[in-house]
């Protein structure tokens, strides 16, 4: 959580940013809050990317104002215009790219003041995993398969009734590159797994990190997966 | 009312170049949507080709991407795709669109069509 | 990219009735999915997006719900003018993609 303030003491206003993560190829949210004012057409909202010249958006006078918006994000960003009188300043970015990652500002003017606060975005890609059971092998062997991470990511292996134990000589796992030549489908096998028990598979790069778990007994599979991302950061 | 009308050959020979227009008529394609191109073979389901802002902004589908170009021309109120190398399987309806885009709400709908053209692709 | 299951290929329903149609997303597409109708030597006609928001002018007959990766197209009393084919369509991620289509038709 970063939260910023205006520098001229009563002139000043609270705005409150968190550091988020944008999964390539799909769209973004960039968020950003600040102190309400009473009326629409007394704020202003610009968005800044570090490194770029041009604005990423502006919206004055209860309107979206993008002359000076750069190239880069041309129709490709809003803001929730509904919900600015309520002191949302967050923006939506279509079809996030790697190259969206940076330092953004989100920088308010109202009636009360000024303020602004920084937003570390970064971009890659994550998604769930599944864990199924693999009929077609030799052996019982579990599959874990998610379809989309960028960068590549770790893969590791645990088991509920064997805590602690290390997994890496009896899994093996492999990246496979996505038509779009940037994201990897991951895919890990564990060999030799026991009934009765509980295994996951955890996979981790700098951005995110998923597991999918799956208890295998004599009647019946359960599965659940879980997504979180590491660095949602206030500030 | 928003209206789409494509124009274009409805007979393109294989190795050669499918050319298509869409004119946009009751609003003006510098507004806040993306245009989009979409693709319905004879009995089949749909598949995006490509989209483009009135900046020139585009994003293209994967599969298509190396032999699809889609162009704007504000003055005209029109843009247009070119479909390269095409194959009997490029044969298809060819739909123009516009995405929904309204502010608040996700891009990617499409909430106006043109009525469709057919392009063979045949010797 | 995602791929879009619909089921059944075909249903037939008689008029009056009630008729479900399912959408199912290879991967989580949370509630950016839109429902059209397209009816033969016609363009698709915009239902539902974000899963259950009504086009406008869409009858209240026509509801949608679902988030994630399964979705529902419910059409709750048939009339003769819903007899066409349906399709689903993700954009949570580009490339957008279709559902292959439902196609109701009468019983």
């Known amino acids: 959580l970063i939260i910023g303030f205006g520098i001229s003491g009563r002139h000043s206003i609270t705005v409150t940013t968190v550091a988020s993560a944008g999964n390539i190829g799909e769209d973004g949210i960039l968020s950003c809050t600040f102190e309400p004012d009473i009326k629409l057409s007394d704020i202003v909202i610009q968005w800044l990317k570090e490194g770029v010249l041009g604005l990423v958006h502006e919206f004055k006078e209860g309107k979206d104002e993008l002359s000076e918006q750069d190239e880069m994000f041309r129709g490709r960003t809003a803001v929730f215009a509904d919900q600015v009188i309520v002191g949302n300043a967050s923006l939506r970015l279509k079809n996030v790219q790697l190259t969206d990652a940076g330092t953004y500002k989100c920088y308010i003017i109202t009636s009360k003041g000024k303020g602004n606060a920084n937003l570390e975005y970064k971009t890659g890609a994550f998604s769930m995993p599944e864990v199924n059971v693999d009929y077609n092998a030799s052996s019982e062997t579990l599959r874990c398969e998610a379809p989309r991470w960028f960068p590549q990511p770790t893969v590791v292996w645990a088991s509920q009734v064997d805590q602690g134990a290390n997994f890496s000589e009896v899994s093996n796992t492999s990246f496979e590159l996505n038509s779009e030549n940037v994201t990897m489908k991951v895919v890990s096998v564990l060999y030799n797994v026991t009934i009765n028990n509980t295994y996951s598979c955890m996979i981790e790069n700098d951005i995110a990190k998923a597991t999918g778990d799956i208890k295998v007994t004599e009647s019946e599979i359960k599965r659940r997966s879980h997504l979180q991302l590491l660095n949602s950061k206030a500030s | 009312q928003v209206q789409l009308q494509e124009s274009g050959p409805g007979l393109v020979k294989p190795s050669g170049t499918l050319s298509l227009t869409c004119a946009v008529s009751?609003?003006?394609?510098?507004?806040?949507?993306?245009w989009s191109w979409v693709r319905q073979p004879p009995g089949k389901g749909l598949e995006a080709i490509g989209e483009?802002?009135?900046?020139?902004?585009?994003n293209y589908n994967p599969s298509l991407k190396s032999r699809v170009t889609i162009s704007v021309d504000k003055s005209k109120n029109q843009f247009s795709l070119k479909l390269s190398s095409v194959t009997a399987a490029d044969t298809a309806i060819y739909y123009c669109a516009r995405d929904g885009y309204s502010s608040g709400w996700y891009w990617g709908y499409f909430d106006y069509w043109g009525q469709g053209t057919l392009v063979t692709v045949s010797s | 990219e995602i791929v879009m299951t619909q089921s059944p290929a075909t249903l037939s329903v008689s008029p009056g009735e009630r008729a479900t149609l399912s959408c199912r997303a290879s991967?989580?597409?949370?509630?950016?999915l839109a429902w059209y109708q397209q009816k033969p030597g016609q363009a698709p006609w915009l239902l539902i997006y974000?899963?259950?928001t009504r086009a406008t002018g869409i009858p209240a007959r026509f509801s949608g719900s679902g988030s994630g990766t399964e979705f529902t197209l419910t059409i709750s009393s048939l009339q003769s003018e819903d007899f066409a084919v349906y399709y689903c369509?993700?954009?949570?991620?580009?490339?957008?993609?279709f559902g292959q289509g439902t196609k109701l038709e009468i019983k």
């Open positions: 483009i802002y009135h900046s020139g902004n585009t």
């Open positions: 974000g899963a259950s």
């Open positions: 369509q993700q954009y949570n991620h580009w490339p957008y993609t």
């Open positions: 009751g609003g003006s394609i510098s507004s806040s949507n993306w």
């Open positions: 991967q989580s597409v949370n509630s950016n």
